[in-house]
């Protein structure tokens, strides 16, 4: 689907992640581990990290590298959306952002990436090995989901081979050219991991003064589309069920997503007042039947309707109002 792999420069992990192996030795395996994790998922990337300043606070960052116009992003935990996962946030380019505890702040970072900060206290706080998933719907192309979680807290991602749970089944075109390099890298990584087994495992030492963790490049729309393979940060998936649905989701479900458009109009960057009515700005929109993205808003049965949207002014805006729904 894409032609050339454009891999952003990876910065080394935070200083606190340098253990017995030392800074230099750790960076290469980290890069290789990331490549091994994400090689099969050229469309969606997920990065999960624990805040150095708040050990029980998580930041999930997700990005979409495919073509089309992003029409909906759903972030869930405890598994893929619609397959046992529980929705944490739903981001719509026109209708705004909706989030549920323990999500603290969901926002658009660029036109093709989002971030979500999770509160770390209370019954609904995530465990360190919770799996987080991001699903991107792109009009008129399709929808893809990928998942990730934090490496075990006792080790900065080198103690076990990754077991990613990508729901994404995108074509592998565009990454074939680097497959040889990846194969070599993965083999080399395994070699390093075996050597590393005989050393004391570096402990996670979050530094309160450490710089912000490396961030993925802010892809402009054309860059996002050109990228064949984006290297996020190494994720190792284990499983940890979130708090009960009652605890985690006291709010009503997104009734406004009962019937959703499959498309979002052009979204130039910059602040804007998003349309929030179901009436199209012009009569040219199509109806959406059968709740195309109803699953994105599936909530516990006990929850009720009624949503007020608080569009993120920093996010992308729509050229016109949302699609009319039947």
């Amino acid at each position: 689907m894409r032609t050339e792999a454009q891999v952003p420069a990876l910065q080394p992990p935070e200083p606190g992640l340098e253990g017995a192996m030392g800074h230099r030795t750790l960076v290469l395996p980290w890069v290789l581990l990331t490549l091994c994790v994400t090689a099969g998922t050229p469309e969606v990337w997920v990065q999960v990290r624990m805040e150095a300043t708040e050990l029980s606070s998580f930041t999930i960052r997700c990005g979409f590298l495919g073509s089309g116009s992003i029409s909906l992003v759903t972030v869930s935990w405890g598994g893929p959306n619609g397959a046992g996962g529980t929705t944490l946030a739903v981001l719509h380019p026109e209708r705004g952002i909706r989030q549920w505890a323990p999500a603290r702040q969901a926002r658009w970072e660029t036109q093709s990436s989002i971030s979500l900060i999770l509160e770390g206290s209370g019954a609904s706080s995530p465990c360190a090995n919770t799996t987080f998933c991001c699903k991107f719907a792109s009009f008129p192309e399709g929808s893809w989901e990928a998942c990730g979680s934090l490496p075990p807290s006792s080790d900065p991602g080198l103690s076990a081979p990754p077991t990613p749970a990508p729901i994404l089944r995108a074509d592998l075109a565009g990454i074939l050219g680097v497959s040889g390099v990846l194969l070599f890298g993965c083999v080399y990584l395994l070699h390093l991991l075996r050597r590393h087994k005989h050393r004391p495992a570096p402990r996670l030492q979050p530094s309160r003064t450490s710089p912000q963790a490396p961030r993925a490049r802010a892809w402009a729309p054309s860059q996002a589309s050109q990228a064949a393979l984006h290297v996020p940060y190494a994720t190792i998936n284990t499983s940890c069920r979130p708090a009960t649905l009652d605890t985690a989701h006291p709010h009503g479900g997104p009734s406004w997503w009962a019937s959703l458009p499959t498309h979002a109009a052009h979204r130039p960057q910059g602040p804007a007042a998003w349309a929030s009515t179901p009436i199209p700005a012009r009569g040219s929109f199509v109806s959406v039947e059968n709740g195309l993205y109803a699953q994105a808003g599936e909530r516990p049965p006990h929850t009720g309707p009624g949503l007020t949207l608080f569009p993120d002014p920093r996010g992308p805006r729509a050229m016109e109002g949302p699609l009319g729904v039947r």
């Epitope: 689907m1 469309e43 073509s67 089309g68 116009s69 792109s138 009009f139 008129p140 192309e141 399709g142 929808s143 893809w144 994404l168 089944r169 995108a170 074509d171 729309p221 054309s222 996002a224 589309s225 050109q226 458009p261 499959t262 498309h263 109009a265 052009h266 979204r267 130039p268 040219s284 929109f285 199509v286 959406v288 039947e289 059968n290 709740g291 195309l292 993205y293 109803a294 699953q295 050229m319 016109e320 699609l323």
Partner: antibody
Framework: EVQLQQSGPVLVKPGASVKMSCKAS????????INWVKQRHGKSLEWIGL????????NYNQKFKDKATLTVDKSSTTAYMEFNSLTSDDSSVYYC??????WGQGTTLTVSS | DIQMTQSPSSLSASLGERVSLTCRAS??????LNWLQQEPDGTIKRLIY???SLDSGVPKRFSGSRSGSDYSLTISSLESEDFVDYYC?????????FGGGTKLEIK
């Protein structure tokens, strides 16, 4: 890579209905929506609508919402488009596409008495 | 619906020549534009997505660009297999709409 195989040409009488198919190879739609596009002989293309194979959700061009019905059979990874109340204006080639990247070879529909 | 005006409707050119096809959008579509190629047997292939990104397997002689509401597909050096039909497709607003097409003929 998704490969889409469409059903063969059809000749039907005005007023009838027709159902054409679009089979995805490899037993997967790979996350792609199936779009349907109309092309009148030697003319440009017109988007009819799309279906999300994962849940059967549809999105129609208003112009075709009473003319076309899109469905999908996940078990056979086949998408269908039914066209009703056919007239000579419906005589065209109809394409299915996975997103906008993977295209079927087209199905020729001829409406004639 | 957004109108996509494609020009020229037909174009005669020689092998090795550089040509540009243009689509103009009736309203702002950002970079939400693809270019498609259709062969005489009806086979359709996407060449460019998101205005300027080349699809996998598409020769580098094809490129896409934008200037305001004008979108261009440029073929830097025509080869024999390039003499087919080309269409632009906008997907910024539903329904997606296509340009009228350009028939590229050998001179």
């Amino acid at each position: 890579e998704v490969q889409l195989q469409q059903s063969g040409p059809v000749l039907v009488k005005p007023g009838a209905s027709v159902k054409m198919s679009c089979k995805a190879s490899g037993n997967t739609f790979n996350g792609y929506y199936i779009n349907w596009v109309k092309q009148r002989h030697g003319k440009s293309l017109e988007w009819i609508g799309l279906i999300d194979p994962s849940n059967g959700g549809t999105n129609y061009n208003q112009k075709f919402k009473d003319k076309a019905t899109l469905t999908v059979d996940k078990s056979s990874t086949t998408a269908y488009m039914e066209f009703n109340s056919l007239t000579s204006d419906d005589s065209s080639v109809y394409y299915c596409a996975g997103g906008t990247v993977y295209w079927g070879q087209g199905t020729t529909l001829t409406v004639s008495s | 619906d957004i109108q996509m005006t494609q020009s020229p409707s037909s174009l005669s050119a020689s092998l090795g020549e550089r040509v540009s096809l243009t689509c103009r959008a009736s309203q702002d579509i950002g970079n939400n534009l693809n270019w498609l190629q259709q062969e005489p047997d009806g086979t359709i292939k996407r060449l460019i997505y998101a205005t300027s990104s080349l699809d996998s397997g598409v020769p580098k002689r094809f490129s896409g660009s934008r200037s305001g509401s004008d979108y261009s597909l440029t073929i830097s050096s025509l080869e024999s297999e390039d003499f087919v039909d080309y269409y632009c497709l906008q997907y910024a607003s539903s329904p997606p709409t296509f340009g009228g097409g350009t028939k590229l003929e050998i001179k």
